[in-house]
């Protein structure tokens, strides 16, 4: 039995619902009483949801899953996963058994956008050209881990003296703190870009130092 799932990962935002598509081709005269459908976590083989003996056997996965009962007879074995969490990320196997059997696995990629970065400066007063300052760029509650880029006002990448740390909170979302140590010129703009590699979403923050005063756009 050929069971089909998407090749590309299903991308779902944290807190939204995701559909893991799975389909099979029922033969003429197929009845739901013949269908045995099982969704499982691929890696641990934990049961997620099942359908057997003509009945939806329900969710075995935190009561956040559902089938599409009206579409099963047409060969649609897709699974709805509600209120997606970071911990849901991974591969799900769809196993279909009628007279024949088959299975296929589909990957769920969880994502969350990063907040607009906040910029802080240390020290933040009485700055002169030649002073060394520490600029911190902070962005919150994103997933997966971010890529962080710094550049000056002319768009030249700043790669030296950058330290980036990413810490996951209890929901698995990351807070990013990136620190740039730089020697001040006469004036200058320093920009931080926090990129979510899955969503291809960029969050920008910048600080402009003009002797006195400083501005934080």
């Amino acid at each position: 039995l050929e069971v089909q799932v998407p090749e590309d990962p299903v991308v779902a935002l944290v807190g939204t619902d995701a559909t893991l598509c799975c389909s099979f081709s029922p033969e003429p005269g197929f009845s739901l009483a013949q269908l045995n459908l099982i969704w499982q976590l691929t890696d641990t083989k934990q049961l997620v949801h099942s359908f057997a003996e003509g009945q939806d056997q329900g969710s075995a996965y935190a009561n956040r899953t559902a089938l599409f009962p009206d579409l099963l007879a047409q060969g649609n074995a897709s699974l709805r996963l509600q209120r997606v969490r970071v911990a849901d990320e991974g591969s799900f196997t769809c196993f279909v058994s009628i007279r024949d059997f088959g299975s296929a696995a589909v990957s769920l990629q969880v994502a969350a956008p990063y907040s607009k970065p906040s910029m802080t400066l240390e020290p933040n007063k009485d700055l002169r050209p030649g002073d060394t300052v520490t600029i911190t760029c902070s962005s919150y509650r994103g997933y997966p881990e971010a890529e962080v880029f710094w550049q000056d006002g002319q768009g030249v990448p700043l790669t030296g003296n950058v330290t980036t740390s990413q810490m996951a909170n209890e929901q698995g979302l990351f807070d990013v703190h990136s620190v740039l140590r730089v020697v001040l010129g006469a004036n200058g703009t320093y920009s931080c870009l926090v990129r979510n590699p899955v969503l291809q979403q960029d969050a920008h923050g910048s600080v402009t130092i003009t002797g006195q005063p400083m501005t934080f756009p």
Epitope: V5, D43, S91, S103, A105, S107
Partner: antibody, heavy 117, light 109 residues
């Protein structure tokens, strides 16, 4: 066509190391769990190690625990088995296997490992 | 000692029906998840049966069944090309490991 192609087998002395590779094609490698299964000359099949789709879940047979390490590179569609502290009883044909649900649906052709002085 | 027990050998003449058993020796083995593999001489094993069902491409001469703590593989209309080693296997949830039976060498007389 779904294919698994093992490489890296050979002759190695007791106590030595070897790394087996398995190149996968024809399926979405990153979504599937994989295993290594071996067969000593004239003997039956013995499961060696298992790895989940992302590489975060691994299980080993007691006979190889602490000596063998299974890993994968999903960007290269490749499965690995690092074998250290090899013994004569590790001599076998090693098969790379694709798993699906509760069965092993695709097997490689195998690569031979001989441990001898 | 394997937790899945198979007879080491079996034989039959062409056209005959042969059955190979696979018995679970511990209670936590799920006989509903037993798979069977055929290994022809000098080749890699191939999936033959899962939970009494054949995957596409396997001749209907091969069938699987289960009863109590045993699973069985039956081959009807035996042919010379069926001469091979046959293995049963299952995943042991409690040990997180695959378990293979010792294998049965089938000879076509």
């Amino acid at each position: 066509e779904v294919q698994l192609l093992e490489s890296g087998g050979g002759l190695v002395q007791p106590g030595g190391s070897l790394r087996l590779s398995c190149a996968a094609s024809g399926f979405t490698f990153r979504s599937y769990a994989m295993s290594w299964v071996r067969q000593a000359p004239g003997k039956g099949l013995e499961w060696v190690a298992y790895i989940g789709s992302s590489g975060g879940t691994t299980y080993y047979a007691d006979s190889v625990k602490g000596r063998f390490t299974i890993s994968r590179d999903n960007s290269k569609n490749t499965l690995y088995l690092q074998m250290n502290s090899l013994r004569a009883e590790d001599t076998a044909v090693y098969y790379c296997v694709k798993e699906s649900y509760y069965y092993m649906d695709v097997w490689g052709q195998g690569t031979t490992v001989t441990v001898s002085s | 000692q394997s937790v899945l027990t198979q007879p080491p050998s079996a034989s039959g003449t062409p056209g005959q029906r042969v059955t190979i058993s696979c018995s679970a020796t511990i209670s936590n083995i799920d006989i509903n998840r037993v798979s069977w593999y055929q290994q022809l001489p000098g080749t890699a094993p191939k999936l033959l049966i899962f939970n009494s069902q054949r995957p596409s491409g396997v001749p209907d001469r091969f069938s699987g069944s289960k009863s109590g703590t045993s699973a069985s593989l039956a081959i009807s209309g035996l042919q010379s090309e069926d001469e091979a080693d046959y293995y049963c296997a299952t995943w042991d949830d409690s040990l997180n490991s695959w378990v293979f039976g010792g294998g049965t060498k089938l000879t076509v007389l």
